[in-house]
Amino acid sequence: KSPVFGPQEVSSVEGNSVSIKCYYPPTSVNRHTRKYWCRKGASGRCITLVSSEGYVSSNYAGRANLTNFPENGTFVVNIAQLSRDDSGHYKCGLGINSRGLSFDVSLEVSQGPELPNGTEVYTVDVGRTVTIKCPFKTENAPKTKALYKKIGQTSVLVIDSRNYVNPNYKDRIRLRIPGTGQLIFTVVIDRLRLSDHGLYLCQAGDGSNRDEKNADLQVLEPEPELVYEDLRGSVTFHCALGLEVANVAKFLCRVNSRETCDVVINTLGKRDSAFEGRILLNPQDKDGSFSVVITGLRKEDEGRYLCGAHSDGQLQEGWPIQAWQLFVNEESTIPRSPTVVKGVAGGSVAVLCPYNPKESQSLKYWCLWEGAQNGRCPLLVESQGLVQEQYEGRLSLLQEPGNGTFTVILNQLTTQDAGFYWCLTNGDTRWRTTVEIKIIEGEPNLKVPGNVTAVLGETLNIPCHFPCKFSSYEKYWCKWSNTGCQTLPSQDEGPSEAFVNCDENSRLVSLTLNPVTRADEGWYWCGVKQGHFYGETAAVYVAVEEKKVAGSRYVSPAKADAAPDEKVLDSGVREIENKAIQDPRLFAEEKVVADTGDQAGGSRASVDSSSSEEQGGSSK
């Protein structure tokens, strides 16, 4: 399908002008290539009428032009002095007329209505209000005032000053007679319907002395605003319906093939399930305006959208509406990224979030979509740091890999983390994207002790087991803070051959803190990554306590959720048995080591990656 988009139908009246805007993907090639407006002939060929290269056909000379706006990815064709002959089928496009990078536009030019002399013309959008002014002479001041609608050769009474109201106008029309000295009465019609369109006649008095005034009321369907957005991106519909409906329920609906309008979202709590997790209705301002944000745009989101106000929260004739025609460009600048990310309870996810690469300095955000109250999105983390304290130790936003993508890592997953999350920046709002986190059955791949208690001044060694499938990945430990996760210095992992013959035993990367200080207390993450792309993580909390005073049963230099049947080794090292660990099968080899011996030359914090055999054999 062509990525060029414009208005499908354009209608105007003889002698008037039209302005036709066409959209295209603003790639470098597209921005500079030829733009054209051509008319389709009976043969199927499309004859150029005006182009961006300066060509103007003789038929259009002096009344048409084409202007390219490369920075917006749009071009505009203006045509003046329209005649009935201009009605027909056209194309706006890029490149060569026959190439197919175009959009079909139908132009209809109609004859203006034949109106009686002195007719006042009122042009009003459907759902809005019109005030028809009716002048009269002094002698008709005390006499009956009335408004008629002309239907063919007959005149139908609409309202008069003797309290008659035509049933078609019930509850939405009033006739106002001014005080003495003012020689104009007015008729106000609210919530205009398309059927109100037509010629009206004001009348004051009767007989040959009566005052008459013609009024032509043109009730227009709102011209849909064209909206051109990228696949996977985001759109915002700003809806301003006026103060008169400020306190009425609002809605956004999409026109279907039957020309009815299906509610997408409304302020009464209704929401189309197709938009679950990717729509927000922003609260209205005191003037009654509101906005609807939709992210994660799909091709099937294309179509005509209406926003409106009605107590039922859905489209009703005669209430104000605003219209948009949404086109979703499949030649998207927004890269593909998973829309669903799966994790296991206790495990982790690493979510890749796209942003406009031209805005690398923009602030990055991640929020959790909540469906309650028309949707809302509390921020969880920003590139400046953590926002919600309940995510302490398990959520981090990383600027890597950069160049249009940032990463959000969430670990210690529970079923309550399942849901929809939005990637945001404070820059280009069209790059808002949605990801769904699903919690599935399974075990975390990385295994660490539950909680660890370290002793001041001594050495702490924390193991992290990883399966063979991660043998080629880079392993790391980092210390979490609310502004990120600071990677700890890594010891040389030894020759890469160590992982070539990976057996069924899990491999081990261990963190050593030597000597333990008060500042070491906090969350530590063990993780795997490939280059700047992050994989799984596991978190462990390290508490720091003073050394036990002599006389206690034994010195416990380091504890890691010790099990009841733990053994105290001669060296003062406690060995953790199977029960202490989240998964006994993988932790049979584990030791949390606190070495009270001489540590000269050891680093303050170090990471060692090796097989469990290399850690010193079995603990049994």
């Epitope: 209705l281 922003n282 301002d285 109250q373 945001l424």
Partner: nanobody
Amino acid sequence: QVQLVESGGGLVQAGGSLRLSCAASGRTINTYVMGWFRQAPGKEREFVARIDWSGSSTDYADSVKGRFTISRDNAKNTVYLQMNSLKPEDTAVYYCAGSAYYSGYVTHRDFGSWGQGTLVTVSS
């Protein structure tokens, strides 16, 4: 979390005007819904006004509608409350508050970051 500091309070005569400012530090507030609340002596803290992250949507307590205007300058990381036609019953400590909601319906319970307050006294 974001730190908020109010200023601009003081003594003013009934019918007068004041402009309160709330300067944020610690992080930018351009995705925060910001609000003003007040607490008169012996009364509960009450909502005054709020403004969404973009500045396009505002909301006011009925008692201040038409007299108070909330605005924000994201570039300066500051929120303002312009108070006109002040009445003695507007006397209170005024608190600035922030809510870390990118978008959507944010209730008055959702404000998590608070300033220390600035006293506004309106004499008759």
